[in-house]
Amino acid sequence: RSRWMKRYLTYRIYNYTPDMKREDVDYIFQKAFQVWSDVTPLRFRKLHKDEADIMILFAFGAHGDFNYFDGKGGTLAHAFYPGPGIQGDAHFDEAETWTKSFQGTNLFLVAVHELGHSLGLQHSNNPKSIMYPTYRYLNPSTFRLSADDIRNIQSLYGAPVKPPSLTKPSSPPSTFCHQSLSFDAVTTVGEKIFFFKDWFFWWKLPGSPATNITSISSIWPSIPSGIQAAYEIESRNQLFLFKDEKYWLINNLVPEPHYPRSIYSLGFSASVKKVDAAVFDPLRQKVYFFVDKHYWRYDVRQELMDPAYPKLISTHFPGIKPKIDAVLYFKRHYYIFQGAYQLEYDPLFRRVTKTLKSTSWFGC
């Protein structure tokens, strides 16, 4: 049977259906891939340009293969088994009305099915299987793969690799309620917040009294100590870590191969030798990089640094004086860490709303 011979796969949504918002389509495919990555060691990364392993497209009729679409109804989509070129690709008939509900044709359900083919699964004769050849509506919010589907995909790729457990190192540093404690980098990671310091990090669930501590090397042996900036793109399960002129990508808590990469590939000028802090704003789909007295803005959709940057922090972030240690995005606010203190900043009204101890997250 055909299968991918690698764990890390890329996908690209070549074009979008006009039936839905682009961000809904992006989210649906991210969730459809997650259905399969949750039960296998496979990891998926979205590309915005170039050839991906799995190219996704919406098309009418003849569209570049022998398998013409037939108009509304009938064939909803088709996908190719793993391999080079067109192999692995998934095509959706634009003549259908694609939706995220029970009306029309639910894109999520068809996507999970087609991506099953893209990963090497054949049709199933079990009506409870998502690989059953006939479309039927199921509630996407409560959707679960059948035991058959899990068994079949795991026969190709095996069970998921457990994410490394966040355990306590043997000699934790002294209490974090120390008055002058500062952090190297702070970011959300899923529902948790990670506070990086030297060779370790603290992590906690907001609102929970429990605080945990883990050495960086125990969870990610390939990542160095002394991380200087970090941000998360939660919708993609991606965590980016920066040190000096390099950065690393952690996907679903697993480091991506072919990293570290140079920060200059992101569009920084040669004068930038390190990033002080970074934060991703999901509402704007921008990453803000803080470097000395300036900040840079990166567009994650276009994968390009925005023109006319860098700009002065003090001019565009009123009330914020350099130098910045770390920035956290949490509940539509930026938390800007400077030494033993942090400023709660509202980016909508462009003003500082609170000054707090940097350790306030730990109940200090």
Epitope: S2, E51, A59, H63, G64, D65, F66, A79, I86, Q87
Partner: antibody, heavy 122, light 103 residues
Framework: EVQLLESGGGLVQPGGSLRLSCAAS????????MHWVRQAPGKGLEWVSG????????FYADSVKGRFTISRDNSKNTLYLQMNSLRAEDTAVYYC???????????????WGRGTLVTVSS | DIQMTQSPSSLSASVGDRVTITCRAN??????LNWYQQKPGKAPELLIY???SLQSGVPSRFSGSGSGTDFTLTISSLQPEDFATYYC?????FGQGTKLEIK
């Protein structure tokens, strides 16, 4: 090593019939789409027909539809092209080509035979 | 129906030259375009698939680019063995071919 060897070509009169064969070796034949592509003397390439792994799915160029039939015998690792009602414009070298694996044909031909010449003339 | 238009139909060049052949589809074929090389009396050979992926064993002087309707095949520095006819192809449709001859 993948090898495709066509046979069955020759001289035939207009309106006549011919059956081409393509013997495949060096790979597992059954999971792959297979195709026939032809080339008239001094002209370009023209796709003729394609067949799915099990033989149930077939495609034809409009120029041969209703006259040519593609088939395969997976137990013999052989592809066939039955050509009926032949016309002068069917004169060409006929190549057998292997597609890459898939439930659907990609039309990506990674291996080709050397071809067999079919001449339709009175 | 999808149609492929290849240009030029013939081309004269010298060893060491950089050569570009173009192929245009009358509607989007995404990145589903392949390039083949054919030498006289021989079967075609796959050079590039999916617009830009080099087939195993093909020299790196060959490259492909494009997406949607416009595609190019580039030979960065012509070698004597590169003089042949080149075809673009998408599913059951071939371009009419470009004959590359020695100047």
């Amino acid at each position: 090593e993948v090898q495709l060897l066509e046979s069955g070509g020759g001289l035939v009169q207009p309106g006549g019939s011919l059956r081409l064969s393509c013997a495949a070796s060096g790979f597992t034949f059954s999971p792959y789409w297979m195709h026939w592509v032809r080339q008239a003397p001094g002209k370009g390439l023209e796709w003729v027909s394609g067949i799915g792994p099990s033989g149930g799915l077939t495609f034809y160029a409009d120029s041969v539809k209703g006259r040519f039939t593609i088939s395969r015998d997976n137990s013999k690792n052989t592809l066939y092209l039955q050509m009926n009602s032949l016309r002068a414009e069917d004169t060409a070298v006929y190549y057998c080509a292997k597609d890459i694996r898939g439930a659907y044909s990609s039309g990506l031909f990674d291996y080709w035979g050397r071809g067999t010449l079919v001449t339709v003339s009175s | 129906d999808i149609q492929m238009t290849q240009s030029p139909s013939s081309l004269s060049a010298s060893v060491g030259d950089r050569v570009t052949i173009t192929c245009r589809a009358n509607q989007s074929i995404y990145t589903y375009l392949n390039w083949y090389q054919q030498k006289p009396g021989k079967a075609p050979e796959l050079l590039i698939y999916a617009a830009s992926s080099l087939q195993s064993g093909v020299p790196s002087r060959f490259s492909g680019s494009g997406s949607g309707t416009d595609f190019t095949l580039t030979i960065s520095s012509l070698q004597p063995e590169d003089f042949a006819t080149y075809y673009c192809q998408q599913a059951g449709i071939f371009g009419q071919g470009t004959k590359l001859e020695i100047k």
